[in-house]
């Protein structure tokens, strides 16, 4: 594809974080809820 | 993520010279990577761009001056063939495909003799 | 070769002021709006503002607001501060993975 670093956009950078972040936040859900019910 | 210049010094004109930018928090496989550089009180000046750590492109003053190529998961060499004083500058490099949103700070090689 | 040309090269204006600062590419950029803007500080790498023609960065103030397409853009920047004196640059992507920088303008605060 003959325009292939514009693949490598800001906005798809920023989606990509907030999918980190919202992962981030349920896995740290997940493990303080386990850690709780022990 | 950020990404980190490394490299620069004095070095005499037609010394080859090889500049190093390493990154982390991200995969160079998925990333454009572009080398920018900036004179003493000049303007920025983009040179080329790395896209996947596969394809290079250069502007076209930069052909057959500049190399850049993926030599590790988390490095992109600079290598500048032939240095003339008119290279002297501060390099960065950056993250993004036209659009770059992850800068260094930069790392300054003088061509003198 | 694309050439971006910035104007003006300089521009000097009050706290509270407003500075417009316009981008001219010699042809279209890719998708009519692959035109970034950056602001840099003596001794500092660029910061990046604006991203595809009009869209603000994470963390940047909507007092920056970047307008244009195809091959005419502009930077204003309303209710100037006294940290917005820096210089500002444009840069423009094209077909063919090619990417070019405008010449800069100083913006002065008085």
């Known amino acids: 594809h003959s325009d292939g670093i514009f693949t490598d956009s800001y906005s798809r950078y920023r989606k990509q974080m907030a999918v980190k972040k919202y992962l981030a936040a349920v896995l740290g859900k997940r493990y303080k809820q386990r850690v709780k019910n022990k | 993520q950020s990404v980190e210049e490394s490299g620069g010094r004095l070095v005499t004109p037609g010394t080859p010279l090889t500049l190093t930018c390493t990154v982390s928090g991200f995969s160079l496989s998925s990333a454009a990577l572009s080398w920018v550089r900036q004179a003493p009180g000049k303007g920025l000046e983009w040179i080329g761009i790395?896209?996947?750590?596969?394809?290079s492109y250069y502007a076209s003053w930069a052909k057959g001056r500049f190399t850049i190529s993926k030599t590790s998961s988390t490095t992109v060499d600079l290598k500048v063939t032939s240095p003339t004083t008119e290279d002297t500058a501060t390099y960065f490099c950056?993250?993004?495909?036209?659009?770059?949103?992850?800068w260094g700070q930069g790392t300054l090689v003088t061509v003198s003799s | 070769a694309q050439v971006l040309t910035q104007t003006p090269s300089s521009v000097s204006a009050a706290v509270g002021g407003t500075v417009t600062i316009n981008c001219q590419s010699s042809k279209s950029v890719y998708n009519n709006n692959w035109l970034s803007w950056y602001q840099q500080k003596p001794g500092q790498p660029p910061k990046f503002l604006i991203y595809?023609?009009?869209n603000l960065a994470s963390g940047v103030p909507s007092r920056f607001k970047g307008s244009g397409s195809g091959t005419q853009f502009t930077l204003t920047i309303s209710d100037l501060e006294c940290d917005d004196a820096a210089t500002y640059y444009c840069a423009g992507g094209y077909s063919g993975n090619i990417v070019g920088f405008g010449g800069g303008t100083e913006v002065v605060v008085k």
């Open positions: 595809q023609a009009s």
């Open positions: 790395i896209d996947k750590g596969v394809m």
């Open positions: 950056a993250r993004g495909g036209g659009e770059f949103f992850i």
